[in-house]
Amino acid sequence: QPSVSPGEPSPPSIHPGKSDLIVRVGDEIRLLCTDPGFVKWTFEILDETNENKQNEWITEKAEATNTGKYTCTNKHGLSNSIYVFVRDPAKLFLVDRSLYGKEDNDTLVRCPLTDPEVTNYSLKGCQGKPLPKDLRFIPDPKAGIMIKSVKRAYHRLCLHCSVDQEGKSVLSEKFILKVRPAFKAVPVVSVSKASYLLREGEEFTVTCTIKDVSSSVYSTWKRENSQTKLQEKYNSWHHGDFNYERQATLTISSARVNDSGVFMCYANNTFGSANVTTTLEVVDKGFINIFPMINTTVFVNDGENVDLIVEYEAFPKPEHQQWIYMNRTFTDKWEDYPKSENESNIRYVSELHLTRLKGTEGGTYTFLVSNSDVNAAIAFNVYVNTKPEILTYDRLVNGMLQCVAAGFPEPTIDWYFCPGTEQRCSASVLPVDVQTLNSSGPPFGKLVVQSSIDSSAFKHNGTVECKAYNDVGKTSAYFNFAFKGNNKEQIHPHTLFTP
């Protein structure tokens, strides 16, 4: 019994004066608490505590469940205890099978003994299975068996408390350990789509997937810069132990333009937090925006190829696309495809492939596209660059020499005179008249130029060269002069094409 200095309050004394008492089942328990300031007896075991205000605690026929700690407390709050074992061969263990362990912490298997004199008090696996090799435990007959530093691998471990009684192993009821994992990483969050584009009145629904080791992970949808509570629905699954998945679905049944914004799926656990965002854009009606990928005025050389390329944004999806030239629709030579295979893609590409263009194929090429809400179009003006072609070269009745050339860009006509038999015609002759004629072809066709000189200026035999040229090339025509006496006897025109 405890001893204290005189004058100080002392704890109560208990009879019998020992820390532990063993009685047989059916026998009497009689405990006496002596103290001038006696207050109460308290009994504790597993799931219950009982109180008794009498200084003598009497249990006439002891049962196994009377096993436990009996504490006497006085008015000073000082106490003394005795632990009573009620030995019952039919009930060696008192049990509470609720067994939870936090990863890396200790947990108590509550199977206190009713008989402290049994041996080999320990844990055993169910169905004869061995316990995990690294499982360490400390037995305490009055409390149970403490498992040290619970591992995640022990989750759903089935075990029994075990003792040897008279040479035989006796097992308690089974315990199943449920391990609550420690969070050692932030949750993994992902979103069904990174961006959404909707028309007013359409339903917005987005799903966030949260993955973590347990359902204790917290998650929520938040609207950035807003405190409004969002309506979300949950589905969740345990894909085996410590592989938990939750899907949090946010829905706005009839989206409005002012619902546009950034929505964040936020998740956290005791380790940290993670988030992912999705952007909602709500438009009052659909749209199409076309972006030419090349200049809308195109110059191309005769016989060469050109690709007319547009990118366009269309929402909702484009329904009809066509390329038109001279009121005719192309049935082939073009392709239309989405810019990306992304589910939320609204950008598309259309390409018209024009091959070996002729001078007659210049003009306006138009791309038209429509969806359920709008139509849009873009025009390309295609000019085909052609080398000049000399259409006519004549001596007119009035003595003028006339040269008419066609090409694109507009040809320039220069005149040269070559005296005698010289091949090189370097002396230039100024034209008397130069006119650009209206072409009867399409507005993007060749331009026709007419130039004239006065042949009376030539006094000697020789050759007159009419040279038509532009950026693409040049072409020449020649007039041969031969004098007999004072008369120009012959003028023989011929052409020479110079590449």
Epitope: E48, T49, Y100, K102, S215
Partner: antibody
């Protein structure tokens, strides 16, 4: 014997918070998990969460996450459940329940929380 | 989460009748042959009362006319001979996996 005695009925305005208490007696308070369950009028039972014995760890039903906090005061053997941002849907009877030997063996008498503008 | 579906939702019976209520779980609630399924009785204005724990164990103080059976996903509560005080609502509950869940309830009424 084991008893769980809950605080009295409450009337709250939408957006407010409520804190329900559950005073335990008749057992070693720190040795047992305390669960909270609610029941809306005419509806079934709904598990809200648990505060584990010993270290005070909690686990909440995701439905209430971010709005619910479960705590204990071991000096008075009392468990508390606070629910924030109340709406009319939170009108219910709230129960505390002690888990022993794998089941909810003891229940409080219930606390009616009415949320009304 | 594990969804528990009780049937029937309501039931009319007479004193002395044998009554069976079933509870089906969306996934197994068993671990090592132990079924983490429990049955509760609730009367109007009262807290639920535990009847059967771990599928088939009768809670102390509960009359023996109540019994439970089943494993895995299918469970049954049987009342062998209805007494007037048995007219109440009955709930199954699983605590195999968080979040713990209850069935929607079966209301047992006097015919």
């Amino acid at each position: 014997q084991v008893q769980l005695v809950q605080s009295g009925a409450e009337v709250k305005k939408p957006g407010a918070s409520v804190k329900v208490s559950c005073k335990a007696s008749g057992y070693t308070f720190t040795s047992y998990n305390m669960h909270w369950v609610r029941q809306a009028p005419g509806q079934g039972l709904e598990w809200m969460g648990v505060i584990y014995s010993g270290n005070g760890d909690t686990s909440y039903n995701q439905k209430f996450k971010g709005r619910v906090t479960m705590t204990t005061d071991t000096s008075t053997s009392t468990a508390y459940m606070e629910l924030r941002s109340l709406t009319s849907d939170d009108t219910a009877v709230y129960y505390c329940a002690r888990e022993r030997d794998t089941r909810f063996g003891n229940w409080g008498q219930g606390t009616l929380v009415t949320v009304s503008a | 989460e594990i969804v528990l579906t009780q049937s029937p939702s309501s039931l009319s019976a007479s004193v002395g009748d044998r009554v069976t209520i079933t509870c089906r779980a969306s996934e197994s609630v068993d671990i090592y042959g132990e079924s983490f399924m429990h049955w509760y009785q609730q009367k109007p204005g009262k807290a639920p009362k535990l009847l059967i724990y771990l599928a088939s164990n009768l809670e102390s103080g509960v009359p023996s006319r109540f019994s439970g059976s089943g494993s895995g996903t299918d469970f049954t509560l049987t009342i062998s001979s209805l007494q007037p005080e048995d007219f109440a609502t009955y709930y199954c509950q699983q605590n195999n996996e968080e979040p713990y869940t209850f069935g929607q309830g079966t209301k047992l009424e006097i015919k």
